[in-house]
Interface confidence: low
């Protein structure tokens, strides 16, 4: 048994009247005192009860008492209106002791057998309380053998009286510019034996304002000022309170940025407490006026410490602080009531002077030198020799500060050289090589680099030529001496160009025939286009209609003449296109290998001979007039021919350019 040495006697047993189960004698008095350990009580019930019945049990009786309280006075066998017999009732001590007294008077009218009772100690459940009684514990009650203990909900701590739960309500710091605080459990009754401290701590420059809201109910006393529970408000300047009772205290303007609120409660009372809504104020800053063409956000009635505003400019205007552009602008109100930075301006976006257009010019449309938002400029290309590619040349100054085309492009338009212009009148004699005049073949390029060769200018920075003519220089492009704008091969007056890179067709195999005999040279600088330097056009899809058998093409160059010398002056010859089968047959016999003439070649010349291109003309253009566009285009590139130039029954063979348009376009666009 857990009762220990202090409780040697058993805490259960049997009691009976003297002589039981026989009749009890007269004039008997017997007293039993039963004691249980602390935290336990005694339970008693009767298994037999037979005593003389008398009014109010004055004669014979069993009296049960616990401490000073009489639990029951029992007699008879069954209860009546005024007397009580135990029946099946169970009796409990109020504490840990129970006194049982048996008494019989001097006589019995008939024999009575008395009583038999059993008792036992049992644990008291201190947590069970009668209706209307105060609970054992404030929050949670836990019963155990021989005792009980109390515990508290989260946010509370058990008071040293072991029953009351005091609120853990100190150390809360409020740093927001406004907020609410209240007594614990508000609007339910606040806890007892608690001491709460709340702090409002705002940045220097703010002043806290306290408003009591909803209801106020703190235990009070009619004569003494707040002796039980009270609320006090302390600032660095003064103390307000104590407050108690049921009247809402007035607004408190603390004129301080720090406030301490103390709330103390005692062990009694049942009151709902208080609720405070706090706000803050500060020295307002001057009201911001938006600059012209700008607006303030957010718009407030006033701006105080830590408040901020931003300035946003209308489309087409930019923020400037003084004369310096800002990515964004936000000003913050300081504690002294001044803004931390001056108001910016919204200045109209200025795209600045437009860039110069190579081979073109720009005109101010809106007004002379006007370069601000929505201003319009018009680019145009130098007439005759240049034309504008894609673009209409109209640009507007947009809000991002860039000149922008109607298609949304921010890059300059491109002035592309006009191709295929020639001073030559058409319909000249076919027979006999003739001297070219200025402007006749402005696309003609002289290539010097080991041997003399020719090429044709494409656009303003590419030269089309034969692969065999530049094969040796493919890895040393800078060795090529490129000259244009001259008629005389040896003249010191020419436009010099240098090669940046040489692109030889990947299908060309040197010294194994002339299939794919085509190459492109990229110049390291653009050349200026004029009447003596103009690019040749590439053939349109429809160009084959101008290159049928017997159609006349013109070859030009400084190659060998009939006298066996390189021409001093640029020469040209008008020659007809030869039927492809006829040309193939001409080169099927020795010393030419079979298949010398391929589908990538075209032939031109007279069956009788005498008119042909020759060594030194390689790479030059065989050109045709497109009668629809009235522009010259390159149909062939001087490639190869018979051992003897101008031989009867043999023809000049030219690379068929129209087969290579995709290859040409790919290289030019990629590089």
């Amino acid at each position: 048994t857990p009762l220990g040495p202090k409780w040697p006697e058993p805490v259960f047993g049997r009691l009976a009247s003297p002589g039981f189960p026989g009749e009890y004698a007269n004039d008997q008095e017997r007293r039993w005192t039963l004691t249980a350990p602390p935290g336990y009580r005694l339970r008693l019930y009767f298994t037999h009860f037979d005593l003389e019945l008398s009014h109010l049990c004055e004669y014979d009786f069993v009296k049960l008492s616990s401490g000073a309280k009489v639990l029951a006075t029992l007699c008879g066998q069954e209860s009546t209106d005024t007397e009580r017999a135990p029946g099946k009732d169970t009796f409990y001590s109020l504490g840990s002791s129970l006194d049982i007294t048996f008494r019989s008077d001097y006589s019995n009218e008939k024999p009575f057998t008395g009583f038999e009772a059993f008792y036992a100690a049992e644990d008291i459940d201190e947590c069970q309380v009668a209706p209307g009684e105060a609970p054992t514990c404030d929050h949670h009650c836990h019963n155990h053998l021989g005792g009980f203990y109390c515990s508290c909900r989260a946010g509370y701590v058990l008071h040293r009286n072991k029953r009351t739960c005091s609120a853990l309500c100190s150390g809360q710091v409020f740093t927001q510019r406004s907020g609410e605080l209240s007594s614990p459990e508000y609007p339910r009754p606040y806890p007892k034996l608690s001491s709460c401290t709340y702090s409002i701590s705002l940045e220097e420059g703010f002043s806290v304002i306290l408003d009591f809201v909803e209801s106020f109910d703190v235990e009070t006393h009619p004569e003494t000022l707040c002796p039980y529970d009270f609320l006090k408000i302390q600032t660095d300047r003064e103390e307000h309170g104590p407050f108690c009772g049921k009247t809402l205290p007035h607004r408190i303007e603390t004129k301080s940025n720090t406030v301490t609120i103390t709330f103390v409660t005692d062990e009694s009372g049942d009151h709902t407490g208080w609720k405070i809504h706090y706000t803050s104020t500060a020295q307002p800053c001057p009201y911001p006026m938006a600059p012209p063409n700008g607006h303030v956000s957010p718009v407030q009635a006033k701006y105080i410490l830590k408040d901020s505003f931003s300035i946003f400019c209308e489309t087409g205007y930019e923020l400037l602080q003084g004369h310096l552009p800002l990515k964004s602008f936000t000003a913050v109100c300081q504690k002294d009531g001044s803004w931390d930075r001056p108001m910016p301006a919204c200045s109209i976006v200025d795209c600045g002077p437009p860039d110069d257009l190579p081979s073109g010019r720009v005109e101010y449309i809106t007004g002379p030198g006007v370069t601000t938002y929505k201003a319009v400029i018009q680019y145009s290309c130098e007439e005759t020799f240049y034309t504008m590619k894609v673009n209409d040349g109209k640009y507007v100054c947009e809000a991002d500060g860039f000149w922008t085309s109607s298609k949304g492009e921010k890059s300059l338009p491109v002035c592309e050289p006009v191709c295929g212009l020639s001073a030559r009148t058409t319909g000249g004699r076919i027979y006999g090589g003739q001297k070219a005049k200025p402007g006749d073949f402005p696309w003609q390029v002289l290539i010097l680099g080991g041997t003399t060769a020719a090429g044709a200018l494409l656009y303003d920075n590419w030269v089309l030529t034969a692969a065999h003519a530049v094969y040796e220089q493919k890895h040393d492009a800078s060795a090529l001496d490129i000259r244009m704008g001259t008629l005389k091969r040896l003249s010191p007056h020419y436009t010099q160009a240098w090669s940046e890179a040489v692109f030889i067709h990947e299908g060309y195999t040197h010294d194994a025939g002339f299939d794919n005999d085509i190459a492109l040279i990229k110049l390291n600088n653009k050349v200026v286009i004029n009447s003596n330097i103009t690019p040749i056009c590439l053939p349109r899809k429809e160009a084959e209609s101008f290159m049928r058998t017997d159609d006349i093409g013109t070859a030009s160059g400084w190659g060998l003449t009939q006298r066996g010398f390189l021409a001093r002056n640029l020469m040209y010859v008008d020659i007809p296109i030869v039927d492809h089968q006829k040309c193939t047959a001409a080169y099927e016999k020795p010393p030419y290998p079979r298949g010398s003439v391929t589908a990538n070649m075209l032939c031109a010349g007279l069956e009788s001979g005498g008119k042909d291109s020759c060594r030194g003309d390689s790479g030059g253009a065989l050109v045709f007039l497109d009668s629809e566009t009235e522009r010259w285009f390159v149909g062939g590139i001087v490639s190869w021919g018979s051992m003897n130039c101008g031989e009867a029954g043999q023809y000049g063979v030219y690379t068929k350019v129209i087969n290579y348009i995709p290859w040409i376009e790919n290289i030019i666009s990629d590089f």
């Epitope: 003084g322 990515k327 930075r341």
Partner: antibody, heavy 125, light 107 residues
Framework: EVQLVESGGGLVQPGRSLSLSCAAS????????MAWVRQTPKKGLEWVAT????????YYRDSVKGRFTISRENAKSTLYLQMDSLRSEDTATYYC??????????????????WGQGVMVTVSS | NIVLTQSPATLSVTPGESVSLSCRAS??????IHWYQQRSNESPRLLIK???RSISGIPSRFSGSGSGTDFTLSINRVESEDFSIYYC?????????FGAGTKLELR
């Protein structure tokens, strides 16, 4: 340590030209707006011109507009002031100065953090 | 242009004294005032930016205050190295201007 060293000053006749240079070291030159400020005993300190960190914009005081050109070469960490059509009132000590980092606090600040030792320009016949 | 007037033109003090230098703007410049120190035969040095913001490396005895049109540079307990000319400068308008300066000299 931030260092700004001006050079190119000297005596020049009215109407002639002079070019000042400022070699910068000890900081990321292309993060800073740069300025020229001049000083005379009579007029005191005068802001002359400012150029943005990337060279995209230039600003001048009214009296030098059209005559002076501020420029910079970020690769060489060098600031320049080309002074044409010089007048006697341009006589001053010219200082090269940083005008604080362009990204500082989300806006461009108009004060001069670091100054060179100054170079004397005398315009006289 | 915004004119900055500095007063007094000259201030005579002994080391250990505390002084205040004034700068007045011809119109409100908010807090866009900056202070510089120029010792004899040296270039100007930035002391205070935006009226009251300190600059790293500048002794804490230098402080600035003011907004709108009236600004003050305070030196707490002047030291011998502080005898210089002090200039204020505004960046409120696009044409930066400087004051004529206050000379702090040894009494």
């Amino acid at each position: 340590e931030v260092q700004l060293v001006e050079s190119g000053g000297g005596l020049v006749q009215p109407g002639r030209s002079l070019s000042l240079s400022c070699a910068a070291s000890g900081f990321t030159f292309n993060d800073y707006n740069m300025a020229w400020v001049r000083q005379t005993p009579k007029k005191g300190l005068e802001w002359v011109a400012t150029i943005l960190f990337d060279g995209s914009r230039t600003y001048y005081r009214d009296s030098v507009k059209g005559r002076f050109t501020i420029s910079r070469e970020n690769a060489k960490s060098t600031l320049y002031l080309q002074m044409d059509s010089l007048r006697s009132e341009d006589t001053a000590t010219y200082y090269c100065s940083t005008e604080s980092p362009y990204y500082s606090e989300g806006y461009y600040q108009g004060y001069f953090d670091y100054w060179g030792q100054g170079v004397m320009v005398t315009v006289s016949s | 242009n915004i004119v900055l007037t500095q007063s007094p033109a000259t201030l005579s003090v002994t080391p250990g004294e505390s002084v205040s230098l004034s700068c007045r703007a011809s119109q409100s410049v908010s807090t866009s005032i900056h202070w510089y120190q120029q010792r004899s035969n040296e270039s100007p040095r930035l002391l205070i930016k935006y009226a009251s913001r300190s600059i790293s490396g500048i002794p804490s005895r230098f402080s600035g205050s003011g907004s709108g049109t009236d600004f003050t540079l305070s030196i707490n307990r002047v030291e011998s190295e502080d005898f210089s000319i002090y200039y204020c400068q505004q960046s409120y308008s696009s044409l930066y201007t400087f004051g004529a300066g206050t000379k702090l000299e040894l009494r």
